[in-house]
């Protein structure tokens, strides 16, 4: 049994880091493998993560963490029984993938303005809470070409757009994702999408 693709890990900078790797053949990850992880800190202990299958030869492990600070570094040991398959380290602050925003809502009752709001996925005491920026994706269910991205570079989790920038009388969907420049993070996963019917009063044409 050998590791074909070494573990790579990302942290949500809150309570979970996710490590993925591939074995050289079909593997029952949860029964055959264990990923031990330990914070490099005085009097810390090793903790065990039981991996799950992620495709035939792929494994994924969700490492529980108390919290994360930039100084943290973890040692990682991948074991198959008594055999050490791989040894490495992981610094969560250098591999951050933020949590996805939630509760995306489209408010259509604000005159002819669409107000999209969502929730910051972090509590106020988390460092990322005040460092997230967002991308909002809006697309038409009827027209695949009608697909747009709005970059929200301010901290408030909301976006206002004129309803007239979208076509009237058709349904749209929206989703949002987040990233943090301070840690050069990857983008989060997209939030679940929300749907609404776009309609607005066309202005009278003056002749």
């Amino acid at each position: 049994m050998k590791v074909l693709q070494e573990p790579t890990c990302v942290s949500d900078y809150m309570s979970i880091s996710t490590c993925e790797w591939k074995m050289n053949g079909p593997t029952n990850c949860s029964t055959e493998l264990r990923l031990l992880y330990q914070l490099v800190f005085l009097l810390s202990e090793a903790h065990t993560c039981i991996p799950e299958n992620n495709g035939g030869a792929g494994c994924v492990c969700h490492l529980l963490m108390d919290d994360v600070v930039s100084a943290d570094n973890y040692t990682l040991d991948l074991w198959a029984g008594q055999q050490l398959l791989w040894k490495g380290s992981f610094k969560p602050s250098e591999h951050v993938k933020p949590r996805a925003p939630g509760n995306l809502t489209v408010h259509t009752n604000v005159s002819d303005t669409l107000l999209l709001t969502w929730s910051n996925p972090y509590p106020p005491d988390n460092y990322l809470y005040n460092h997230l920026t967002y991308a909002v994706n809006i697309w038409s269910e009827n027209d695949p070409a009608d697909f747009r991205i709005y970059n929200v570079t301010y901290l408030e989790p909301s976006l206002r757009i004129a309803a007239s920038t979208l076509k009237s009388g058709i349904s749209y969907r929206a989703r949002v994702r987040a990233w943090a420049q301070c840690y050069n993070t990857t983008w989060s996963e997209w939030s679940p999408s929300t749907k609404w019917h776009n309609s607005y009063r066309e202005p009278f044409e003056q002749h």
Epitope: L42, E45, A46, D66
Partner: antibody
Framework: EVQLVESGGGLVQPGGSLRLSCAVS????????MSWVRQAPGKGLEWVSS????????YYADSVKGRFTISRDNSKNTVYLQMNSLRAEDTAVYYC??????????????????WGQGTTVTVSS | DIVMTQSPLSLPVTPGEPASISCRSS???????????LDWYLQKSGQSPQLLIY???NVAAGVPDRFSGSGSGTDFTLKISRVEAEDVGFYYC?????????FGQGTKLEIK
């Protein structure tokens, strides 16, 4: 009520051995790291050794490394310090102390908040 | 090793007056989680040491509120707002960020 009671001290010749014990009650022993600290006559405090709650992490002062062994028996709520090749400079009162919670991912520290009464080790010919 | 240096080594104080002890570490004892791994202990004559302050500023359970700790990084101070006769003994600072844990030389507080 938290209690730590050391025993096993005494008079021993240079090169001899002693095993100190520290019996603990009043808290969840296996969750906490434990430490030994000593104090030579008329001197200050000197850290000797520490062990994590599960026993997997062990640390020693350079002055005792290779001669002293710390261990614990969580079923007996007891931490031990096996002292071999004793020297005159090991003469001291030895205290055990309750250290940080070590079973969490990041050990949680509240100081060495409880100490035993100490046991005296005298190394002399 | 992190060297801890205390001053003064002797501190005669009049009861009711304030007292202050300084502790300096040769390297920072501040970890990235924002905590300073610096404690203060009092050892009264013939007794075991007792914890006064942990993580730089936190007063241990049962310790009178006349004791307080301050400082960060490498410079720390223990203050007693009004010294009482029962406060006599040796005061030690100790860092527990890295092994070996290291103590200051001790400050002897005595009543004038």
């Amino acid at each position: 009520e938290v209690q730590l009671v050391e025993s096993g001290g005494g008079l021993v010749q240079p090169g001899g051995s002693l095993r100190l014990s520290c019996a603990v009650s009043g808290f969840t022993f296996s969750s906490y790291a434990m430490s030994w600290v000593r104090q030579a006559p008329g001197k200050g405090l000197e850290w000797v050794s520490s062990i994590t709650g599960g026993g997997g992490g062990i640390y020693y002062a350079d002055s005792v490394k290779g001669r002293f062994t710390i261990s614990r028996d969580n079923s007996k709520n007891t931490v031990y310090l096996q002292m071999n090749s004793l020297r005159a400079e090991d003469t001291a009162v030895y205290y055990c102390a309750k250290d940080r919670i070590s079973i969490t991912i990041r050990p949680r520290y509240f100081g060495l908040d409880f100490w035993g009464q100490g046991t005296t080790v005298t190394v002399s010919s | 090793d992190i060297v801890m240096t205390q001053s003064p080594l002797s501190l005669p104080v009049t009861p009711g007056e304030p007292a202050s002890i300084s502790c300096r570490s040769s390297r920072s004892v501040l970890y990235g989680n924002g905590y300073n791994y610096l404690d203060w202990y009092l050892q009264k004559s013939g007794q075991s040491p007792q914890l006064l302050i942990y993580l730089g500023t936190n007063v241990a359970a049962g310790v009178p509120d006349r004791f307080s700790g301050s400082g960060s990084g490498t410079d720390f101070t223990l203050k007693i707002s009004r010294v009482e006769a029962e406060d006599v003994g040796f005061y030690y600072c100790m860092q527990s960020l890295r092994t070996p844990y290291t103590f200051g030389q001790g400050t002897k507080l005595e009543i004038k």
